[in-house]
Interface confidence: low
């Protein structure tokens, strides 16, 4: 079946280039033979030229830029409400941790109050710092929390007598904390299972964020001139022989769509392996790899860490008394 | 897990309290995501195809456009690139992918690494290793004193996800809520740990 | 120091609706719901329905399904609630009370620790 | 709806005396999780009214430890041990984010 002849007055392309480019007098008015074409090269006369060619190759990259940009924004949603939930909920999980450690502290050693309450604040602050990517050591974290609560367990709960803390004995007995072990092994459980559970914590925010930039990425793609000129062929060369309502072949679609998408189509081995390496990762994630176990239930810990403490009173003030002598008679005189 | 008010009380005239469909919780809005997120695993390959199927193409035309010319749509010349003097779908495709797209693969390359090195190996988090690190409840070592489960008025099995607290309390200046705060269990997965803190129910 | 702090009172004839208001301070205010509980003249307490602050959710009693309507503003922290058709039985104190926080997957639940000083 | 019975509905107490409210609902308050959602509340005289206990048992923020809750499933009681001229007001117990009881004066 031969094709119906082209549109002897360009008529019907003039008017829906104009929908295109209002106003321009680029159209030919009656089909001409396109000797100056590059990208709808014609077979006989043709009602485009040069200057339209341009503006349909144009048309052609943004349609695709807005084609892609459909195609992935309900996964795009997706991520990004995710990965804002998370983030949120991570926060909100931080701060009743905070909250029921110093409640712990307020209810079973209010002597420690004041000074716990900003241990437990810093250390906290540093558990949604890290999480959020900050290059922060958390056996440091926790280190820094045991160093700190233990001169205020000594001279607050174990020695009273003693006057005011001074930064000398301080100092000693941030020294001795490590040395004698005074918490026992529950620093380096609490450091096990923090650490564990806030680095999953973090690369799972890290991941989430990360495909928000992959999308990102491939959602703002500039598609190349060779490209633009395959859909310009593809969706308006049959405009210049006067074909208006006939459409691309699906075949024909499928192969400039590959073509054009060749680098982006690469992505697909590691997007499928970021699933499923995430899926991996929040099957692994409950335990001591689940920040909200393992933080909501960090004021249980410290409280048995202080009890062991106390039950061990007697003979740690005995040998701190000896290892700290020096400072405490610098305090006295 | 987490309780809230639409699961506890869906049915106004029966109160539902003995069986919640829907006791979501942090990990099971993450393993919700992740089923979300494998519904687009082929997304990047099926990409291509969802553009054709969502851009205008002929599907009950009988003839349609190739490029070059107008053809009988099951014709051969249907699927064949017309005007291939122009030039080669072969050679716009060993031009290799855009810089910004070989930097997002480096960047997924990287994150997928970390993920495997994170990922928690199967039936790590119940061998010995545990044990070690002083979760279970089974041996504490040679020293009784060390032992996570020694301490504490009682053993309050504790499960994993929210753990229940119980009277923390009191009103306290700091931050922004009373430490008195109540939290969910889920059934699975339940370690023995002591609470010594406050009134258990 | 955690507070909830309502409206003034308001005079309204039947079939009118009203709005009334709860601000809250001292506290996050996207990590709890409200409640709202009124009490008519001379009688005990009856519970209108929640909202989560957190993402809006609601679960209203039955009884006064499709006449109110609770919402938030977290930009000011402020929750509203908003009953419409008033009937002379309506006549009572409002009050607001920071209740649990809830969104599909999170909930800790409280007890309604907080409460407003009531709107008549 | 559930139905939330408080008795007796008038408790005179001399102060220094000890107080018991009880408090049924017409089915189980019992959750699934183990936990019973049931609250108290006390309305003193013209203020709004106030949290004593939550989840059946747990003693409220600032609440005096003379205020205990019991019970589970469908029978809840309030004691109060040593009543105190401060806690003259109305009790309720209520099926947490549902129904109140009558009251309790």
């Known amino acids: 079946q031969p094709p119906p002849p082209p549109d002897a007055t360009c008529h019907q392309v003039r008017s829906f280039f104009q929908r295109l480019q209002p106003g321009l007098k680029w159209v030919p008015e009656t089909p001409v033979p396109g000797s100056d074409l590059q990208v709808c090269l014609p077979k006989g006369p043709t009602c485009c030229s040069r200057k339209m060619e341009e503006k349909y190759q144009l048309t052609a990259r943004l349609n695709m830029e807005q084609l892609l940009q459909s195609a992935s924004m309900e996964l795009k949603f997706l991520i990004i409400q995710n990965a804002a939930v998370f983030q949120e909920a991570f926060e909100i999980v931080v701060r009743h941790a905070k909250n029921y450690t110093n409640a712990m502290f307020k209810n079973n050693y209010p002597s420690l109050t004041p000074q716990a309450f900003e241990f437990v604040g810093e250390f906290f602050t540093d558990v949604s710092l890290y999480i959020l990517g900050s290059d922060i050591n958390v056996d440091d974290m926790v280190n820094e929390l045991f160093d700190s609560l233990f001169p205020v367990i000594y001279t607050q709960m174990m020695n009273p007598g003693l006057p005011e803390s001074v930064l000398d004995i301080n100092e000693c007995l941030r020294g001795a904390r490590r040395d004698l072990k005074v918490f026992g092994s529950f620093p380096k459980l609490i450091m096990t299972q923090v650490s564990k559970s806030l680095q999953v914590t973090r690369i799972f925010l890290q991941a989430l964020n990360l495909g928000i930039e992959v999308i990102n990425t491939t959602d703002h793609l500039k598609f190349s001139k060779d490209c633009g000129r395959m859909l310009t062929r593809m969706w308006y060369c049959s405009y210049c022989q006067g074909l208006m309502m006939v459409k691309p072949c699906g075949g024909y679609c499928n192969v400039v769509m590959q073509g054009c998408m060749a680098g982006v189509v690469e992505i697909d081995k590691y997007w499928r392996e970021y699933i499923l390496s995430l899926e991996e990762l929040v099957n692994g994630m409950y335990r001591i790899y689940d920040m909200e176990n393992v933080l909501l239930g960090l004021f249980s810990t410290i409280h048995d860490s202080i009890q062991y403490v106390q039950k061990n009173g007697g003979k740690l003030t005995t040998t701190i008394g000896k290892l700290c002598a020096h400072s405490q008679q610098r305090q006295y005189r | 897990s987490a309780y809230y008010p639409e699961d506890l009380f869906i049915d106004k005239k029966i109160l539902k309290v003995a069986h919640v469909e829907h006791e979501e919780t942090l990990s099971s809005r993450r393993r919700e995501l992740i089923q979300k997120l494998k519904s687009f695993i082929n997304f990047y390959s099926a990409l291509p195809g969802y553009i054709c199927s969502h851009s205008p193409v002929a599907e009950n035309d009988t003839l349609c456009w190739n490029g070059q010319e107008l053809v009988e749509r099951y014709s051969q010349k249907a699927a064949r690139n017309g005007m291939k003097n122009q030039f080669n779908l072969h050679e716009l495709k060993m031009k290799g992918p855009e810089p910004v797209v070989s930097q997002i693969i480096d960047k997924l390359k990287h994150i997928n690494q970390l993920l495997r090195t994170m990922s928690v190996p199967k039936g790590k988090v119940l061998d010995k290793s545990l044990d070690e690190e002083g979760l279970e409840s089974g041996d504490c070592g040679d020293d009784e004193d060390e032992c996570i489960g020694s301490s504490g008025d009682g053993m309050v099995k504790v499960k994993n996800q929210l753990r229940f607290l119980a009277e923390l309390a009191y009103d306290l200046d700091v931050d922004d809520a009373p430490g008195n705060k109540q939290h969910g269990n889920q059934k699975d997965n339940e370690i023995t740990t002591s609470h010594s803190v406050g009134n258990m129910p | 120091e955690v507070q909830l702090v309502q409206s003034g009172a308001e005079v309204k004839k039947p079939g009118a609706s009203v709005k009334v208001s709860c601000k809250a301070s001292?506290?996050?205010?996207?990590?709890?719901?409200i409640s709202w509980v009124r009490q008519a003249p001379g009688q005990g307490l009856e519970w209108m329905g929640w909202i989560s602050a957190y993402n809006g959710n609601t679960n209203y009693a039955q009884k006064l399904q499709g006449r109110v309507t609770m919402t938030t503003d977290t930009s000011t922290s402020t929750a509203y609630m908003e009953l419409r058709s008033l009937r002379s039985d309506d006549t009572a104190v409002y009050y607001c009370a920071r209740d649990g926080l809830s969104s599909s997957w999170f909930y800790y639940y409280y007890g309604m620790d907080v409460w407003g000083q009531g709107t008549t | 709806d559930v139905v939330m019975t408080q008795s007796p509905l008038s408790l005179p107490v001399t102060p220094g005396e000890p107080a018991s409210i009880s408090c049924r609902s017409s089915?189980?308050?019992?959750?699934?999780?183990?936990?019973?959602?049931l609250d108290w509340y006390l309305q003193k005289p013209g203020q709004s009214p106030q949290l004593l206990i939550y989840l059946g048992s747990n003693r409220a923020s600032g609440v005096p430890d003379r205020f205990s809750g019991s019970g589970s499933g469908t029978d809840f009681t309030l004691k109060i041990s040593r009543v105190e001229a401060e806690d003259v007001g109305v009790y309720y117990c209520m099926q947490a984010l549902q129904t109140f009881g009558q009251g309790t004066k």
């Open positions: 001292g506290y996050t205010f996207t990590s709890y719901g």
């Open positions: 089915q189980s308050l019992l959750h699934s999780n183990g936990y019973n959602y």
